[in-house]
């Protein structure tokens, strides 16, 4: 049940006065109190609770000779750099003997000039591409009112009429300047300036408009640039390996791309210098004054196949009576896709040219018509891929077969 | 003289809600937390939460954080405690007390017995 | 949170008899910076208000007669009452202080 008979008689002569000043500032709060006997530690409470790391200092005056003559206690707290952390209700504590005694209150408050929390940040936009930029100010003195500017143009009537924490910016065409200004009753606080810089959308519908062994033809339809004409587009191709990382969509490819720069407009390049029958992706990007846009996906393309570009090697023919034996080898240049087989052409001198498709072997025996008595008997070679063929071999004469 | 005076009883419909009172007197109200304690009957005692009047700072035990909440009115020196959803398991005896910082004095009201029961 | 143990639940004495209870906290209850254990003991009897007999784990009450006695320091703590009187039936809680307020679970004392 209460028990109000407690004595409760507080030893503070001293209370805490009030400190209200802007951020930054440095005050002290005072505590004395008169004690008979050994001085107690003096504590500090700010809403409460006991100060754990308080910058606090403590003298004592003894006010007679003796031990248990009276004694003054001062006890100041040093605020430094004045946050809104400190504020709040600050008392002093004392454990005299059983008893707690807790002194009058004092108050610390923040008052001056807003402070930024979140201030606009410098950043890259798409040109005619919405964004959106944020500030937040706060005092103590509350409200706080928002004006946003743009290349120093505030972008409403007054302060508070216009957007507060966010900005809506629909698009721009040019690179531009933003900054917010926080207004209280103390006055004006004024964030750093932003720069929005105007980069190219990212080019659309990059797209093959021919294709060779060792080229390909592509166009792009180019994004609006703003106020800044593109000066160049660059191109990337890189060779794909089924494993790799750009098909899952990641930014980067595996291996150095090969780079090719196109003066616009046109836009399109050619791309020469390619491997046949391979698979590639590319991608492009296109520059302003401000800077490049964002890279295309990945577009993934194939170069065709190609005639291989030499005829087959070592070439031998034999005849032997009515029959003739023909070996050669795969042709050593590059074979621009996929071997589907060889032609073989023999002729006489005054008989028609015979045209075989042999497949993919490497050999074949020739039934010669008659006796075999046709003079001056030559063969031909040739290797083909699904483009067609290569070219043909020089002709070879057939040689009488020795036993032996 | 200091006092911590709370009405009696209360009787509320289940379902409904309930504001508690706790006037202070004899001291400085706003220097001193106020703390309230559940008490269901033949049951021990539970800490509910606290509230500094000076700033209004609350602290609630997790247990009764969607049940409770604490308010102050420094120009009356009253502590009230408001009770939500109330059912037969919120019937109980609601103490508030002054901490004295772990210390002597400490003054507990006698606290009001609310029932809940349609 | 600070978890608070008491034992026993109850017990049963006769008038004139040394009783102890004890309290255990699941970490210390000692301020480093006051040099004080925030331990109390409170005393309730049916239909009444807690009433407070030991503060800082072993300072009493101004009031409360001598046969209590708090001590402990750190995480155990116990209470003794030196000769049970017919008054000192009752439930007797522990309380912590050191970080918000828990109760322990009490400690019923009957007089056979």
């Known amino acids: 049940a209460p028990r109000g008979t407690q004595a409760e008689e507080s030893p503070f002569v001293g209370n805490p006065g009030n400190i209200t000043g802007a951020r930054g500032l440095t005050g002290t709060l005072r505590c004395q109190l008169q004690v008979q006997g050994e001085p107690p530690e003096v504590h500090w409470l700010r809403d409460g609770q006991i100060l754990e790391l308080a910058d606090s200092t403590q003298t004592q005056v003894p006010l007679g000779e003796d031990e248990q003559d009276d004694w003054i206690v001062v006890s100041q707290l040093r605020i430094t750099s004045l946050q809104l952390s400190d504020t709040g209700q600050y008392q002093c504590l004392v454990f005299l003997g059983h008893q707690t005694f807790v002194s009058q209150p004092g108050y610390v408050g923040l008052e001056g000039l807003p402070y930024f929390l979140e201030e606009p940040e410098d950043r890259t936009v798409a040109a005619n591409t919405p964004f959106n930029l944020s500030c937040q100010a706060q005092g103590p003195p509350e409200p706080v009112d928002l004006l946003w500017l743009q290349d120093a143009v505030p972008l409403a009537t007054a302060p508070g009429h216009g957007p507060q924490r966010s900005l809506h910016v629909p698009g721009l065409n040019k690179t531009s300047s933003f900054s917010c200004e926080a207004h209280n009753a103390k006055g004006v606080t004024t964030s750093r300036t932003a720069t929005i810089t105007v980069l190219p959308q990212q080019p659309r519908n990059l797209h093959l408009v021919s294709r060779q062994p060792t080229e390909l033809e592509v166009a792009w339809t180019p994004g609006l640039s703003g106020i800044y004409p593109l000066t160049h587009c660059t191109l990337q191709a890189v060779l794909s390996d089924d494993g790799m990382g750009i098909q899952a969509g990641e930014p980067d490819p595996p291996e150095e791309p090969l780079t090719s720069q196109a003066s616009v407009p046109p836009h399109q390049l050619r791309l020469g210098s390619l491997h046949p029958h391979t698979p590639y992706h590319i991608r492009v990007a296109c520059t302003s004054s401000q800077g490049p846009s964002s890279w295309t996906h990945w577009l993934p393309v194939e170069t065709p196949e190609g005639v291989p570009l030499g005829p087959p090697e070592n070439i031998s023919a034999t005849r032997n009576g009515s029959q003739a034996f023909v070996h050669w080898q795969e042709p050593r240049a590059p074979l621009q896709g996929t071997l589907l087989g060889y032609r073989l052409a023999y002729q006489g001198q005054d008989t028609p040219e015979v045209l075989m498709d042999i497949g993919l072997r490497q050999e074949v025996t020739l039934e010669l018509q008659g006796d075999g008595s046709v003079s001056n008997l030559t063969v031909c070679v040739a290797a083909y891929t699904a483009a067609g063929d290569g070219p043909w071999s020089l002709p070879v004469p057939l040689e009488a077969w020795r036993p032996g | 003289q200091v006092q911590l005076q709370q009405p009696g009883a209360e009787l509320v419909k289940p379902g409904a809600s309930v504001q508690l009172s706790c006037k202070a007197s004899?001291?400085?109200?706003?220097?001193?937390?106020i703390n309230w304690v559940k008490q269901r009957p033949g049951q021990g005692l539970e800490w509910m939460g606290n509230?500094?009047?000076?700033?209004?700072?609350?602290n609630y035990n997790e247990k009764f954080k969607s049940k409770a909440t604490l308010t102050v009115d420094k120009s009356s020196s009253t502590a009230y405690m408001q009770l939500s959803s109330l059912t037969s398991e919120d019937s109980a005896v609601y103490f508030c007390?002054?901490?004295?910082?772990?210390?002597?004095?400490?003054?507990w009201g006698q606290g009001t017995t609310l029932t809940v029961s349609s | 949170d600070i978890v608070m143990s008491q034992s026993p639940s109850s017990l049963a004495v006769s008038a004139g008899e040394r009783v102890t209870m004890s309290c255990k906290s699941s970490?210390?209850?000692?301020?480093?910076?006051?040099?004080?254990?925030?331990l109390a003991w409170y005393q309730q009897k049916p239909g009444q208000s807690p009433k407070l007999l030991i503060y800082?784990?072993?300072t009493r009450e101004s009031g409360v007669p001598d046969r209590f006695t708090g001590s402990g320091s750190g995480t155990d703590f116990t209470l003794t009452i030196s000769s049970v009187q017919a008054e000192d039936l009752a439930v007797y809680y522990c309380?912590?202080?050191?970080?918000?307020?828990?109760f322990g679970g009490g400690t019923k004392l009957e007089i056979k």
């Open positions: 007390a002054r901490d004295y910082y772990g210390g002597s004095p400490d003054y």
């Open positions: 004899g001291y400085t109200f706003i220097s001193f937390w």
């Open positions: 509230i500094f009047p000076g700033s209004s700072s609350t």
């Open positions: 970490q210390s209850l000692l301020n480093t910076r006051t040099r004080k254990n925030y």
């Open positions: 800082w784990a072993s």
């Open positions: 309380k912590q202080s050191y970080n918000l307020w828990t």
